[in-house]
């Protein structure tokens, strides 16, 4: 069996779909094009995945190896506090907003960044190798 993350257990370990990267127990999709946060979320959901929810500092550090200076949307939003799309609070890293419109979270090789959700950015989707498993 795949070793589960904090939020899910992937029941088996097949390979990931084309253009997805297998890392640990999950498949990751790093986009080539750019979209706003909502469109990025829709893209991931349509592929039985979700905008990247990072479970801990270790996962964040490992993923940052694949990132550049360019920011990518992740499943992080400020709704009365920074929370991941699975509802869990951001508690292993820090992000701060410089203006009231910066309510979505992005990541690059240097860390997390608050941004206006309207900015077109690359994005990262995450899913278990089987589409019928938990999203996170």
């Amino acid at each position: 069996l795949c070793q589960g993350s904090n939020y899910s257990t992937c029941a088996s370990c097949p390979s990931c779909p084309d253009r997805w990267m297998k890392y640990g127990n999950h498949c990751y999709y790093f986009s080539v094009e750019e979209k706003d946060w909502n469109s990025s979320l829709e893209f991931c959901l349509a592929r039985d995945s979700h905008l990247l929810v990072i479970t801990d500092n270790q996962e964040m550090s490992l993923l940052q190896v694949f990132l550049s200076e360019a920011f990518c949307w992740i499943g992080l939003r400020n709704n009365s506090g920074w929370r991941w799309e699975d509802g869990s609070p951001l508690n292993f890293s820090r992000i701060s907003s410089n203006s009231f419109v910066q309510t979505c979270g992005a990541i690059n090789k240097n860390g997390l960044q608050a941004s206006s959700c309207e900015v077109p950015l690359h994005w990262v989707c995450k899913k278990c190798p089987f589409a019928d498993q938990a999203l996170f």
């Epitope: 920011f71 907003s97 410089n98 203006s99 009231f100 419109v101 910066q102 992005a106 960044q113 608050a114 941004s115 206006s116 309207e118 900015v119 077109p120």
Partner: antibody
Framework: EVQLVESGGGLVKPGGSLRLSCAAS????????MSWVRQAPGKGLEWVAT????????YYADSVKGRFTISRDNAKNTLYLQMSSLRAEDTAVYYC?????????????WGQGTLVTVSS | DIQMTQSPSSLSASVGDRVTITCRAS??????LAWYQQKPGKAPKFLIH???TLAEGVPSRFSGSGSGTDFTLTISSLQPEDFATYYC?????????FGQGTKLEIK
């Protein structure tokens, strides 16, 4: 190089209307919030209005709310300020300004300004 | 609305002097403060954001500090081109309020 060029200023009578334009170049206009800031002769800076990337959200200073409308045409890389019911106190140099990116709403780049004079 | 108050309103100094301009917010704005320089007949120039982060291309003799309600802009050694009017600005929320300006003149 980021360039913002304002136009449309001039002399207008109280109660009149005017539309200012700001032509943007040297950056991807459709990625940035844009704003108007004004400066009355011999006075300080006053924020007037800000518009989101898509144009779906607009924000105004109380002094111009209901009289001024900020808009943008991303296909034309142009920002607008429609001013109506103009008053003597609206006399100022009007600057177009671009934010710092990602919704960082400081005014990182400024145009050279266009003078609006409201007088009978 | 948050009010921004600068002091002094004007200041005379000489080339080589160390100069400090103060900006006070009417309530806690954390670090959401920008500074601008404006010369007569010109558009303002962006200097600093988040109270202390220098904009690209701004000389290192400029520095910003403070958080909460009290902020300062310091020029460590005045150069002839630094004589201008300086404005602080709250950049987190609406309205984006400016201070009234500090005019830095040659003594």
């Amino acid at each position: 190089e980021v360039q913002l060029v304002e136009s449309g200023g001039g002399l207008v009578k109280p109660g009149g209307s005017l539309r200012l334009s700001c032509a943007a170049s040297g950056f991807t206009f459709s990625r940035y919030y844009m704003s108007w800031v004004r400066q009355a002769p011999g006075k300080g800076l006053e924020w007037v209005a800000t518009i989101s990337i898509s144009g779906g959200s607009t924000y105004y200073a109380d002094s111009v709310k209901g009289r001024f409308t900020i808009s943008r045409d991303n296909a034309k890389n142009t920002l607008y300020l429609q001013m109506s019911s103009l008053r003597a106190e609206d006399t100022a140099v009007y600057y177009c300004a671009r934010e710092g990116g990602y919704g960082n709403l400081w005014f990182a780049y400024w145009g050279q300004g266009t003078l609006v004079t409201v007088s009978s | 609305d948050i009010q921004m108050t600068q002091s002094p309103s004007s200041l005379s100094a000489s080339v080589g002097d160390r100069v400090t301009i103060t900006c006070r917010a009417s309530e806690n704005i954390y670090s959401a403060l920008a500074w601008y320089q404006q010369k007569p007949g010109k558009a303002p120039k962006f200097l600093i954001h988040n109270a202390k982060t220098l904009a690209e291309g701004v000389p290192s003799r400029f520095s910003g500090s403070g958080s909460g309600t009290d902020f300062t802009l310091t020029i460590s050694s005045l150069q002839p081109e630094d004589f201008a009017t300086y404005y602080c600005q709250y950049h987190y929320g609406i309205p984006f309020t400016f201070g009234q300006g500090t005019k830095l003149e040659i003594k």
